[in-house]
């Protein structure tokens, strides 16, 4: 059958019918339904929501909807022994204690099972000692402290402000610096936008608000006890001492009211420069320890959380493809939340729900997609991307052979200014073409396309007249699909104006104040931005599943490969003498990129000209496109990060949220001037250039004519 026969409706009409069926009012209704109680991973409430979603997806018309369960390591506070931090005097008396819970938002005072703020997977402990303020606890902050200011964090409790980088990286850096505990806090400089009221009167963080979150350094491993394999009924589990990525020192998060009580007494060194000062009325002294009258006082942490193997549930829905049922396009987002999940994740889950409903409506009218679409409601994302990773580990053989694309669907909004897209270069043209067909929801862009408002508000730094599209990093459920399995991936959401709002994320992220009312009152009262995100995510899935030729343009990969090669070469050229001494050459990489560019160009020409009515040739060309992302996977993985296998992109070793290009070379070059054995260090740079050049060349050859 031809594609059109199989789907019964002309392709153009299909897409329009699908998009027209998406309704803002439904997304609003779904968001309300998903946010009335907490849905913490591993709890009965989240299991019940999984079953509700399973039932509703069946009603919407999917062919099958199954629960996939795993028994993974999670972390919870002790209900009878709360976590807190004290200031103690010389007699050991607690003269100040941090809060035990956040002040509940209006209307939620009587909700039970609100988990108090905690750092998931913190070990137990009651360390006491002097405090050192370490700014954002980034790699460069510890360099400043240790190398420039000669401040030793060994045996100290460090206090770091949230923002800039993933919290797990902060904890890892503190551990490496010898700290014996970490206090994380939200500074108003990063989580309180000027001119906006705090919740419930606005979308800013109140002083009692606290950001929860895991502090793992999993590097893509999934469940810490079963790295590489699914945490199923017959799994062999590591002992806790061998678990992947667990922190070794106690960690606890606090709000800025409590932080002020700790920071106002700080003595020792003054902050090195203004970039170390936040917005509290405190000196931001680095320490160590308290000033003058308070010098005999210490800080003591009381952490009693426990790690527990707990059952989690993914919901997996299938809409079978009519022509290529063995080709999978996946739309997935998580369901578990820290508390109510008003933005994270339910603003995304509500959009997925409406996309499923729209696809189901078309299916009930006799339509089917060309390829199979899988829909996923992941569990335990907040605990380290566990649900998605375990499912991908269980289904890795199918996915690596059949996975066309993965579209992520966590929070639909983190602001209401413009679109934000991170994706593989293969999807650039798909995103551009789709957004040109969608209406902008933005004020002042009535009757204009989404592409136009997006490009105006978030222009590409390289190409004029085009919007910014960012690299994929991690910190979300696409990680296993892209970084481990090499399946083309993308994500889209509405974001803030990064120029005017320098705070990190959105202010109420992972706090009790992330409610339905936050979204409905302050971010998107008409749910028009949610609808736009639904159209982008749904439209991408539709095109990927239904277009006869996969909507991937390999020439865009060629362009970025050249850009990334130039960038990494520039970094290396900061050491011209060493490059000469150790005969470091990037010729092989540039040659491979040149070859890739030429072969990609020829492939694109063939793609225009081939006989699309020949199903064998069509399948062959589509397979070359599908497997191109796969070709960038190195089966051996990156050094010390075996589950990060993509040679072109990996999460930054210094910030899990950020993507790094040519990460193997980048990490080999990082801080190379401080390495004790320069010959060995530059040898590793050369090895990484070799791996990258080989991989790019090998990927190029997958696009060559097959015979």
């Amino acid at each position: 059958k031809s594609s059109n026969e199989a789907t019964n409706i002309t392709p153009k009409h299909n897409m329009k019918a699908f998009l027209d069926e998406l309704k803002a009012e439904n997304i609003k209704k779904f968001l309300y339904n998903f946010t009335q109680i907490p849905h913490l991973a591993g709890t009965e409430q989240n299991f019940q929501l999984a079953k509700q979603i399973q039932s509703q997806w069946k009603e919407f018309g999917l062919d099958s909807v199954e629960l996939a369960h795993y028994d993974v390591l999670l972390s919870y506070p002790n209900k009878t022994h709360p976590n807190y931090i004290s200031i103690i005097n010389e007699d050991g008396n607690e003269i100040f204690n941090t809060s035990l819970f956040e002040p509940p938002p209006p209307g939620y005072e009587n909700v039970s099972d609100i988990v108090p703020p905690f750092s998931a997977f913190s070990p137990q402990g009651m360390p006491e000692g002097d405090l050192v303020y370490v700014n954002y606890a980034r790699t460069e902050d510890f360099f400043k402290l240790e190398r420039d200011m000669k401040i030793n964090c060994s045996g100290k409790i460090v206090i770091a402000r949230y923002g800039k980088v993933f919290r797990g990286n902060k904890v890892k850096n503190a551990q490496l610096a010898g700290a014996k505990g970490v206090i994380l806090y939200s500074d108003p400089a990063d989580y309180f936008a000027p001119g906006v009221k705090s919740y419930p009167d606005g979308w800013n963080l109140p002083g009692g608000g606290v950001q929860r979150g895991n502090i793992l350094n999993l590097n893509g491993a999934g469940d810490p006890l079963t790295p590489g394999y699914p945490a199923n009924e017959y799994a062999y589990r590591r002992g806790i001492a061998e678990a992947v990525g667990l922190p070794s020192i106690p960690v606890h998060p606090i709000g800025y009211y409590d932080a002020q009580k700790l920071l106002e007494k700080m003595g020792g060194s003054a902050p090195p420069d203004s970039s170390w000062r936040g917005s509290l009325k405190v000196p931001y002294n680095v320490g160590p320890g308290f000033t003058g009258n308070f010098s005999t006082q210490k800080v003591k942490m009381h952490i009693h959380s426990t790690n527990e193997v707990t059952r989690i549930y993914n919901v997996i829905g299938t809409l079978r493809g009519a022509v290529e049922p063995d080709r999978y396009v996946i739309l997935g987002g998580h369901r578990d939340s820290w508390v109510f999940g008003g933005i994270d994740p339910q603003s995304g889950a509500a959009v997925v729900h409406e996309i499923v409903r729209s696809f189901g409506t078309l299916k009930k009218e006799g339509w089917r997609p060309r390829r199979t679409i899988l829909f996923a409601s992941w569990d335990a994302e907040e605990f380290g991307l566990l649900g998605s990773t375990e499912w991908a580990e269980e289904n890795s053989r199918l996915l690596q052979e059949r996975g066309v694309a993965y579209i992520n669907a966590d929070s639909s909004i983190e602001g209401n200014y413009t679109l934000r897209v991170d994706c593989t270069p293969l999807m650039y043209s798909l995103v551009h073409n789709l957004t040109k067909e969608l209406k902008s929801p933005d004020e002042g862009f009535e009757g204009k396309s989404l592409y136009e408002s997006w490009t105006k508000k978030s222009p590409s730094p390289e190409f004029s007249g085009m919007p910014r599209i960012s690299k994929l990093g991690s910190g979300n459920d696409f990680e296993v699909f892209f970084q481990r399995l090499g399946i083309a991936s993308g994500r889209a959401r509405y974001t803030k104006n990064w120029e005017t709002n320098k705070f990190s994320g959105y202010p109420l992220y992972h706090s009790v104040y992330e409610t339905y009312e936050l979204v409905e009152k302050f971010y998107d009262p008409m749910f028009k931005y949610h609808l736009t995100v639904a159209q982008v995510r749904g439209g991408m899935v539709f095109e990927l599943a239904n277009s006869i030729v996969l909507p991937f343009d390999c020439r865009d990969y060629a362009v970025v490969l050249r850009k990334y090669a130039d960038k990494i070469y520039s970094i290396s050229m900061k050491h011209p003498q060493e490059m000469k001494t150790y005969s470091v050459s990037f010729d092989s990489l540039f040659s491979a990129v040149k070859n890739f560019t030429e072969i990609a160009s020829k492939f694109s020409e063939r793609l225009q000209d081939f006989d699309k009515s020949n199903p064998i040739v069509l399948r062959m060309m589509n397979d070359q496109l599908m497997f191109l992302e796969r070709a960038f996977i190195d089966p051996l993985g990156l050094p010390d990060r075996p589950f990060y296998r993509h040679v072109i992109y990996a999460p930054s070793s210094h910030n899990k949220y950020a993507g790094e290009s040519f990460p193997g070379i980048y990490d080999a070059l990082f801080d190379i001037e401080s390495k004790v054995d320069p010959s060995k260090a530059w040898g590793e740079v050369k090895r990484q250039i070799y791996v990258a050049a080989f991989t790019v060349q090998a990927a190029a050859e997958t696009l060559s004519e097959v015979a």
Epitope: N97, S99, E109, Y257, Q260, K261, K281
Partner: antibody, heavy 122, light 109 residues
Framework: QVQLQESGGDVVQPGRSLRLSCAAS????????LHWVRQAPGRGLEWVTL????????YYADSVKGRFTISRDNSKNTLYLQMNSLRAEDTAVYYC???????????????WGQGTTVTVSS | SYELTQPPSVSVAPGQTARITCGGN??????VHWYQQKPGQAPVLVVY???DRPSGIPERFSGTNSGNTATLTISRAEAGDEADYYC???????????FGGGTKLTVLG
């Protein structure tokens, strides 16, 4: 509307005890720090004690430390002041007051009760 | 322990500007709050965090704070403004709330 209502004031002899209550309504009680402030006849305002919204911190004026105890029952929306070993100088109108935000330290008191009178006299 | 010093009394003609000061060591580094108390009534917050006004308080009430002095300014004074005014801070050295001694504002005439 937002209200605080003190009760329990009385005439007592020196050395005796008294418990004041402050019933709250119209706001999310468990989300705010609370104070007791007193005013002796013809005198200015004198801070007595505070409690944080979750009860984890309590601070007292030196003049009452060891004799007075502040507590709260968030399920009953009620603040308490247990006063032991009362002295003549504790004679005053006692006000309970709510802080403008959850933090009870650096921020102002935006809602006050009408006060309850405690007289310590033999 | 930390002390706040207020003038016992301030007089102002109707329609003129009254200024009530509150002195304290390096008070500019603290947040200052001001209360109005009329005879037989509970205090009312009129300015918080140095210069912010609660809803319902007229714009005529304003505050400043720097160095060793905080000031409550009442412009276009009215007879109804006649009351005792108290400044207040949190002293983090002693973990105490501190009130000033109070200033009696008289609106002449």
């Amino acid at each position: 509307q937002v209200q605080l209502q003190e009760s329990g004031g009385d005439v007592v002899q020196p050395g005796r005890s008294l418990r004041l209550s402050c019933a709250a309504s119209g706001f999310s009680f468990s989300g705010y720090g609370l104070h007791w402030v007193r005013q002796a006849p013809g005198r200015g305002l004198e801070w007595v004690t505070l409690i944080s919204y979750d009860g984890s911190n309590k601070y007292y004026a030196d003049s009452v430390k060891g004799r007075f105890t502040i507590s709260r029952d968030n399920s009953k929306n009620t603040l308490y002041l247990q006063m032991n070993s009362l002295r003549a100088e504790d004679t005053a109108v006692y006000y309970c007051a709510k802080t403008t935000v959850s933090d009870p330290y650096y921020y102002g008191m935006d809602v006050w009760g009408q006060g309850t009178t405690v007289t310590v006299s033999s | 322990s930390y002390e706040l010093t207020q003038p016992p009394s301030v007089s102002v003609a109707p329609g003129q500007t009254a200024r009530i000061t509150c002195g304290g060591n390096n008070i500019g580094s603290k947040s200052v709050h001001w209360y109005q108390q009329k005879p037989g009534q509970a205090p009312v917050l009129v300015v918080y965090d140095d210069s912010d006004r609660p809803s319902g308080i007229p714009e005529r009430f304003s505050g400043t704070n720097s160095g060793n002095t905080a000031t409550l300014t009442i412009s276009r004074a009215e007879a109804g403004d006649e009351a005792d005014y108290y400044c207040q801070v949190w002293d983090s050295s002693s973990d105490h709330v501190v009130f000033g001694g109070g200033t009696k504002l008289t609106v002449l005439g």
